[in-house]
């Protein structure tokens, strides 16, 4: 069965956009004008996950690329990575847990909590041009709030 999905871009609460940094990393920086075309377009898929009142399980793929954000342990630390997948099998309704994020929406701001590692969130740094990462703190220096912009399919 087809997975329900939509195309979107994400900006952090400081209005930094997300762009590719090499083949398997995203970074966050302020973009303007024509440079906005550099920002990555996500295909957000609505997948199976644990029932919760305020959390919607999603997978975040890069549109028209066989890459998905995933959460794995590296050196015993939860880490965000871009993982290559077989396009014949993805996206799917029952995504492996490492690909699943709980989308939490509060006042039109979004947080993306790792389903694999509860209380770890997709995060950006205050500083410009730094990698997007999985952070274990909310409300501190690092940014965990995003806004979503719909993109025409």
């Amino acid at each position: 069965a087809p997975v329900r999905s939509l195309n979107c871009t994400l900006r952090d609460s400081q209005q930094k956009s997300l762009v590719m940094s090499g083949p398997y990393e995203l970074k966050a920086l302020h973009l303007q004008g024509q440079d906005m075309e550099q920002q990555v377009v996500f295909s957000m898929s609505f997948v199976q996950g644990e029932e919760s009142n305020d959390k919607i399980p999603v997978a975040l793929g890069l549109k028209e690329k066989n890459l998905y954000l995933s959460c794995v342990l590296k050196d015993d630390k939860p880490t965000l990575q871009l993982e290559s997948v077989d396009p014949k099998n993805y996206p799917k309704k029952k995504m492996e847990k490492r690909f699943v994020f709980n989308k939490i929406e509060i006042n039109n701001k979004l947080e993306f909590e790792s389903a694999q590692f509860p209380n770890w969130y997709i995060s950006t740094s205050q500083a410009e041009n730094m990698p997007v990462f999985l952070g274990g703190t909310k409300g501190g220096q690092d940014i965990t709030d995003f806004t979503m912009q719909f993109v025409s399919s």
Epitope: L6, C8, E51, K93, K103, F150, S153
Partner: antibody, heavy 120, light 107 residues
Framework: QVQLVQSGAEVKKPGASVKVSCKVS????????IEWVRQAPGKGLEWIGE????????NYNEKFKGKATITADTSTDTAYMELSSLRSEDTAVYYC?????????????WGQGTLVTVSS | DIQMTQSPSSLSASVGDRVTITCKAS??????LSWFQQKPGKAPKSLIY???RLVDGVPSRFSGSASGTDYTLTISSLQPEDFATYYC?????????FGQGTKLEIK
């Protein structure tokens, strides 16, 4: 408050087309899917398809592919469903409804319905 | 397509009665299940979504529950305005499918 106002009743001849509109107000148009549902006289409800206006994403019930065309105009916050090659069995009330973009809230709001009668 | 088998197709009850209507899904629908009320000549009205969450403004006498692929709408104490036709809907997989309806009549 949220309102979905549909166009008025239509009487069409077999083979003709009809375009039903659904004008929404009271919420951000681009953040809600517009659903289209039909109900033949004395019958149950049948899902036709959906559109996410801000994304131009459209999903159809295979049964209605080639019969229904769903579009949306974000400048007027209006969704449309055009039915082609009408036959008597297309006589029904057609409803629009809404569901939040992430599907979490169900088909919360409904239009009043548009009766399409196909008769020679 | 996912089949939603709704039962009973009709039901006679009295004001104050407790009634239950059931929908059985032909496969897992991940709790994407809504219930609607429809009165003659009117649009459906949303009552419950995601199995058990009440739509704003819907009286608390309406409740929903699930057991496996069986989904239940319960009206704890029927009021005169509750006599109508009720439909379930699965919106987990395309095409979304409705139950065939349960007509709730006054005994």
């Amino acid at each position: 408050q949220v309102q979905l106002v549909q166009s008025g009743a239509e009487v069409k001849k077999p083979g003709a087309s009809v375009k039903v509109s659904c004008k929404v107000s009271g919420y951000t148009f681009s953040r809600y899917w517009i659903e289209w549902v039909r109900q033949a006289p004395g019958k149950g409800l049948e899902w036709i398809g959906e559109i996410l206006p801000g994304n131009v994403n459209i999903n159809y019930n295979e049964k209605f592919k080639g019969k229904a065309t769903i579009t949306a105009d974000t400048s007027t916050d209006t969704a449309y469903m055009e039915l082609s090659s009408l036959r008597s069995e297309d006589t029904a009330v057609y409803y629009c409804s809404t569901i939040y973009y992430d599907y979490d809230q169900g088909f919360t709001y409904w239009g009043q319905g548009t009766l399409v009668t196909v008769s020679s | 397509d996912i089949q939603m088998t709704q039962s009973p197709s009709s039901l006679s009850a009295s004001v104050g009665d407790r009634v239950t209507i059931t929908c059985k899904a032909s496969q897992d629908i991940d709790r994407y299940l809504s219930w609607f009320q429809q009165k003659p000549g009117k649009a459906p009205k949303s009552l419950i979504y995601r199995v058990k969450r009440l739509v704003d403004g819907v009286p608390s006498r309406f409740s929903g529950s699930a057991s496996g692929t069986d989904y239940t709408l319960t009206i704890s104490s029927l009021q005169p305005e509750d006599f109508a036709t009720y439909y379930c809907l699965q919106y987990d997989e395309f095409p979304y499918t409705f139950g065939q309806g349960t007509k709730l009549e006054i005994k």
